[in-house]
């Protein structure tokens, strides 16, 4: 007689997550009598998946009406398909008796599940960093499958290099995770620069996922300082201007100082923003030169963002005064002033 | 009740071994048979398996590099392509009365040297 | 892929005391217990010592402790005989259907 062949005609079958899959099975001869069951995996570990006889598997139904005479399709539908449906299943035919015998196998068919990949999250470094620092950023998206997959990094459109990407597990697994870092440096022009991370998969149908970070949460431009004496007033007073120009972000602090002694605090709020994203302020400080003997020095000290403070100072000649208004004043910078 | 494999020789890169384990003494209502090979001087390696039933499973490095498959009297490991790195003794150990994975019973080992 | 690390590589202990080894794997095992444990001499093939990570195969002495569960496990000698001198190897069962092994432990007695 002609030897039982237990026939899965598809070596694979993908199927999106959430639909169902048909597992196909057919016997060659109804002879011997005894039952066909599915398992999921060949070895010791593998798992009941549907016993028509006895057991409750909800989500998996027959394609053929198994009670009928004469059946020889034993393909079956597993509805809801999720990540974890993932594996090879095996058609086997059991010789009935007590207890049934394992009599043959079919050659397996390997389920495998598209999973879309979640949303790509871009995270930034903790501290800022100033323009020629190099910044990291991290882009994770996690639950696709299968396993390929194309992350790409950009800034203001141009494809980003200095890209790390790594896809785990290694080996087989019923979902994958993609971690990926840039390494992006920094400019004083790239307060309004964005970083994309961009995730392209077979789920996605062309239509890739993206994940944005604004460099604004990630850059510290320092500001520029210059301090410098508008012409003598009619009453004996000079009008000094500290000019704070191109720095971000806008929290900054700025303290007059005559002769080494605090004169007045200042916050910067509510600035209107340069085209580039940066923010300019500017301070007076009215000094009454016939109130002074001696010259008096005028410091400028910026604190900005939590930084070391950056001071310019000035001094007003009172010695000269009122005659040689515009010669008797010099400036001397007594700070590191960043750039 | 035994295992024992056999076909192991030199064979050049490229030629198609194929090596049996035959199983002898069992009531057979259901067993597993995994092939796991060993280097010299290295560790196991475990390669595929098989049950009763002929259905076949294998590690993703050894899939389409061997083929394990069931005849009425063997279960054979073909290497369909050997490399010098396929040099090893190759052991095949039966999973038999056992429901976690493990092999109770071990052939000997059978050499298979890959040279030119 | 599903990888079992052990540790350590190697380790000498005198006659009568004790070794343990771990075997750390990078996902659960399926059931939390598919878990073996082997022992092997130079030209010989290994032989099952413990199963489903704590049951003892047959004719093993009572010297031999298996525990863990998940993704940790481990491996405890006992009493040390100049006959435990040998390779032990951990081998994990995963729902994917693998059941690769860890790297070895030689153990060596004083």
């Known amino acids: 007689e002609e030897e039982l062949q237990v026939i899965q005609p598809e070596k694979s079958v993908s199927v999106a997550a959430g639909d169902s899959a048909t597992l196909n099975c057919t016997v060659s001869s109804l002879i011997p009598v005894g039952p066909i069951q599915w398992f999921r995996g060949a070895g010791p570990g593998r798992e009941l998946i549907y016993n028509l006889k006895e057991g409750h598997f909800p989500r998996v139904t027959p394609v053929s009406d198994p009670t009928k005479r004469n059946n020889m399709d034993f393909s079956i539908r597993i509805s809801n398909i999720t990540p974890a449906d993932a594996g090879t299943y095996y058609c086997v035919k059991f010789r009935k008796g007590s207890p049934d015998v394992e009599l043959k196998s079919g050659a397996g068919t390997e389920l495998s599940v598209r999973a879309k990949p979640s949303a790509p999250v871009v995270s930034g470094p903790a501290v800022r960093a100033t323009a020629e620092h190099t910044v990291s950023f991290t882009c994770e998206s996690h639950g696709f499958s299968p396993r390929d997959i194309t992350l790409k990094w950009f800034k203001n459109g141009n494809e980003l290099s200095d890209v790390q990407t790594n896809v785990d597990p290694a080996g087989k697994s019923v979902s994958y995770s993609i971690r990926s870092t840039a390494r992006v440096v920094l400019t004083r022009r790239d307060v309004h620069s964005q970083v994309i991370c961009e995730v392209a998969h077979v789920t996605l149908q062309g239509d890739p996922l993206r994940g944005t970070a604004n460099l604004s949460e990630a850059i510290r431009v320092p500001p520029f300082l210059e301090v410098t004496q508008q012409s003598m007033r009619a009453d004996n007073q000079v009008n000094v201007t500290c000019q704070v120009t191109k720095f971000y972000p806008q929290r900054l602090q700025l303290t007059w100082l005559e002769n080494g002694n605090v004169s007045r605090t200042e916050m910067a709020s509510a600035l209107p923003e340069n085209k580039d994203g940066t923010y300019n302020w500017t301070s007076w400080l009215l000094v009454n030169v016939s109130a002074h003997r001696d010259d008096v020095k005028l410091t400028c000290q910026v604190e900005h963002d939590g930084q070391p403070a950056v001071n310019k100072s000035f001094s007003v000649k009172v010695s000269a005064h009122p005659k040689e208004q515009g010669s008797n004043t010099a400036a001397e910078n007594t700070g590191t002033n960043e750039r | 009740q035994s295992v024992e494999e056999s076909g192991g020789r030199l064979v050049t890169p490229g030629t198609p071994l194929t090596l049996a384990c035959t199983v002898s003494?069992?009531?057979?209502?259901?067993?597993?048979i995994s092939w796991v090979r060993q280097a010299p001087e290295k560790g196991l390696e475990y390669i595929g398996i098989?049950?009763?039933?002929?259905g076949a499973s294998y590690a993703s490095w050894a899939k389409g590099r061997f083929t394990i498959s069931k005849t009425s009297t063997t279960v054979d490991l073909k290497i369909t392509s050997p490399t010098p790195e396929d040099t090893a003794t190759y052991f095949c150990?039966?999973?038999?009365?056992?429901?976690?994975?493990?092999?109770?019973?071990w052939g000997p080992g059978t050499l298979v040297t890959v040279s030119l | 892929a599903q990888v079992l690390t052990q540790t350590p590589a190697s380790v000498s202990a005198a006659v009568g005391g004790t070794v343990t080894i771990s075997c750390q794997s990078s996902?659960?095992?399926?059931?939390?217990?598919?878990l073996s444990w082997y022992q092997q001499k130079p030209g010989k093939p290994p032989k099952l010592l413990i199963y489903?990570?704590?049951t003892l195969a047959s004719g093993v002495p009572s010297r031999f402790k298996g525990s863990g569960s998940g993704t940790q496990f481990t491996l405890t000698i006992s009493d040390l005989e100049s006959d435990d001198a040998a390779t032990y190897f951990c081998q994990g069962g995963y729902r994917t259907d693998i059941y690769p092994f860890g790297g070895g432990t030689e153990v060596v007695v004083k």
């Open positions: 150990a039966m999973s038999y009365g056992m429901d976690t994975g493990a092999f109770n019973i």
């Open positions: 996902e659960s095992v399926y059931k939390n217990n598919f």
């Open positions: 489903g990570a704590s």
């Open positions: 003494g069992f009531s057979l209502i259901s067993y597993y």
């Open positions: 098989i049950n009763i039933g002929g």
